[in-house]
């Protein structure tokens, strides 16, 4: 039975050329997190596995940094980075939990963080 919820940074915005931290947090479950995948549409950006550690996909390694924690830092943002990002928590014994973050990369300097929200 999947009882947990994923809290994410929700809808966020950031300036072109800047950086942003994508963060998710799994709560309300005692399940062990065995792996976290970070994905964007049809791209697998990074994996953090309890045994193997972090892997950043080769096409992103120049602009993506692991952490903090199980989060992901995107650097040198471009407007093409605008879109949906998913944190996928693989857990034992529950299974898979998915959180969604929408990132908007802005040309101007009026970027603000959105509200946090939860996905069960």
């Amino acid at each position: 039975m999947m009882t947990g919820t994923i809290e994410t940074t929700g809808n966020i915005s950031a300036e072109k050329g800047g950086s942003i931290i994508l963060q998710c947090h799994l709560s309300s479950t005692t399940a062990q997190v065995t792996q976290v995948n970070w994905e964007q549409q049809d791209q697998l950006l990074a994996i953090c596995n309890a045994d193997l550690g972090w892997h950043i996909s080769p096409s992103f390694k120049d602009r993506v940094a692991p952490g903090p924690g199980l989060g992901l830092t995107l650097q040198s943002l471009t407007v093409n980075d605008t879109g949906e990002y998913f944190c996928i928590y693989h857990t034992y014994p529950d299974g898979t939990y998915t959180g969604r973050i929408f990132l908007e990369v802005l040309e101007s300097s009026v970027a603000e963080h959105g509200a946090r929200f939860q996905i069960p």
Partner: antibody
Framework: EVQLQQSGPELVKPGASVKISCKAS????????IHWVKQNHVKTLEWIGR????????SYNQNFKGKASLTVDLSSSTAYMEVHSLTSEDSAVYYC?????????????WGQGTSVTVSS | DIQMTQSPSSLSASLGERVSLTCRAS??????LSWLQQKPDGTIKRLIY???TLDSGVPKRFSGSRSGSDYSLTISSLESEDFADYYC?????????FGGGTKLEIK
Amino acid sequence: EVQLQQSGPELVKPGASVKISCKASGYSFTGSYIHWVKQNHVKTLEWIGRINPHNGPTSYNQNFKGKASLTVDLSSSTAYMEVHSLTSEDSAVYYCVRYDGYYGGALDYWGQGTSVTVSS
Amino acid sequence: DIQMTQSPSSLSASLGERVSLTCRASQEISGYLSWLQQKPDGTIKRLIYAASTLDSGVPKRFSGSRSGSDYSLTISSLESEDFADYYCLQYASYPYTFGGGTKLEIK
């Protein structure tokens, strides 16, 4: 015991579509992603894409965007893949595979495969 | 896409013999690799994941190892049921990609 039971062989005409089913049992269907893999007549394996049964997000191999569509029916714990505009190149065996959502070990349990033959 | 170059493409060996298959990744995959066995009836079974972790129920004569970008599957002493096709799979990046396969036949 985890099982993925696929539908039977299909003989279809060029230009038509085919929909293959994959019924999951022995685990929580929403707890693990379902992936699809193609094996052609020379035994080459090719990853098509995956779907999150919990809330439906998909990721596709660019080679299969517009060619394959992935869906699920939660009420019957069944995943589906529809292949469109069939040509002889689509004649192959198609496998559904469970992503190991518990230990993060990728594709663990495989369906028995569904043979699709495209012929007029 | 990450290319997985598998060798040899075919291999004839005798019962009791030790054999090794290799996959080389064109880019870093950090150990996110599994080995699959396909029987003649088409059934596919995962043997190893995370480069060296044996699946439950898989005989201990199977082992996986890594040296840099080279990943190996070794069968220490071949038994009759081991004659099959073997594939490596990288799951570090989309699209997941497979090796070309090794057909293991009885000599």
